[in-house]
């Protein structure tokens, strides 16, 4: 296979340091050149790479949304770390946004866990101690259930 470099404009800007790939891969904080001969550093605060790679570009840094606080900034080897503001949380199954934590538990339940950036408050039934799934019945709703049957979904 032959290679022709048609691109003098491909030369990296001075701030992008270069080094040679090791076994075809570039270290964290770099991406590979088109011809595979050079490792080009990611741009601090703009993009990053966390692993040895042969990718043509570094990954774009995450920008924290409003409603999030930045725990640590983006470096060339690590993405920005964002966390939900106090009083809000992000669940694994809905990672796109921070949701407000509930202010209290439904009737007949007690709080056993506080609001954290990763979880809502945790409620359990007073008697059985089983966890509440998070579907909140209206506070004024009356509990009508047969004995031994929880009034709302439990895990």
């Amino acid at each position: 296979i032959t290679q022709q470099d048609l691109a003098p404009q491909q030369r990296a800007a001075p701030q992008q340091k270069r080094s040679s790939p090791s076994e075809g891969l570039c270290p964290p904080g770099h991406h590979i050149s088109e011809d595979g001969r050079d490792c080009i550093s990611c741009k601090y605060g703009q993009d990053y790479s966390t692993h040895w790679n042969d990718l043509l570009f570094c990954l774009r840094c995450t920008r924290c949304d409003s409603g999030e606080v930045e725990l640590s900034p983006c470096t060339t080897t690590r993405n920005t770390v964002c966390q939900c503001e106090e009083g809000t949380f992000r669940e694994e199954d809905s990672p796109e946004m921070c949701r407000k934590c509930r202010t209290g538990c439904p009737r007949g339940m007690v709080k056993v866990g506080d609001c954290t950036p990763w979880s809502d408050i945790e409620c359990v039934h007073k008697e059985s101690g089983t966890k509440h799934s998070g579907e909140v019945p209206a506070v004024e709703e009356t509990v009508t259930s047969s004995p031994g049957t929880p009034a709302s979904p439990c895990s």
Epitope: I1, Q3, Q4, D5, L6, A7, Q9, Q10, G24, H31, I32, S33, E34, D35, G36, R37, D54, L55, L56, F57
Partner: nanobody, 123 residues
Framework: EVQLLESGGGEVQPGGSLRLSCAAS????????MSWFRQAPGKGLEFVSA????????YYAESVKGRFTISRDNAKNTLYLQMSSLRAEDTAVYYC????????????????WGQGTLVTVKP
Amino acid sequence: EVQLLESGGGEVQPGGSLRLSCAASGLTFPNYGMSWFRQAPGKGLEFVSAIYWSGGTVYYAESVKGRFTISRDNAKNTLYLQMSSLRAEDTAVYYCAVTIRGAATQTWKYDYWGQGTLVTVKP
């Protein structure tokens, strides 16, 4: 979703020419390589040529160097392969493929593939 659509294949006599096209859509990467691979009847996939979108770095297989020319139209997001001095051994299904890896001449470095277009060279 990345989509690649090849066209331009057909039957041609030895010594003749053909121009293949590959229209790409859904490519949102900062840079990528586009390649032509081919598969002759009963044979494995063979790298033909590659071109990179940002810098324009180009690769050719020795078997096609001097006869085939790869090019791209950035505005149309289209890849081309101008094939001339065609030989019987160029008969194959030609596939367009996209990579986000450097120096990519191996099939495993490619994540996106077209359906292929058949080129037949016979007297």
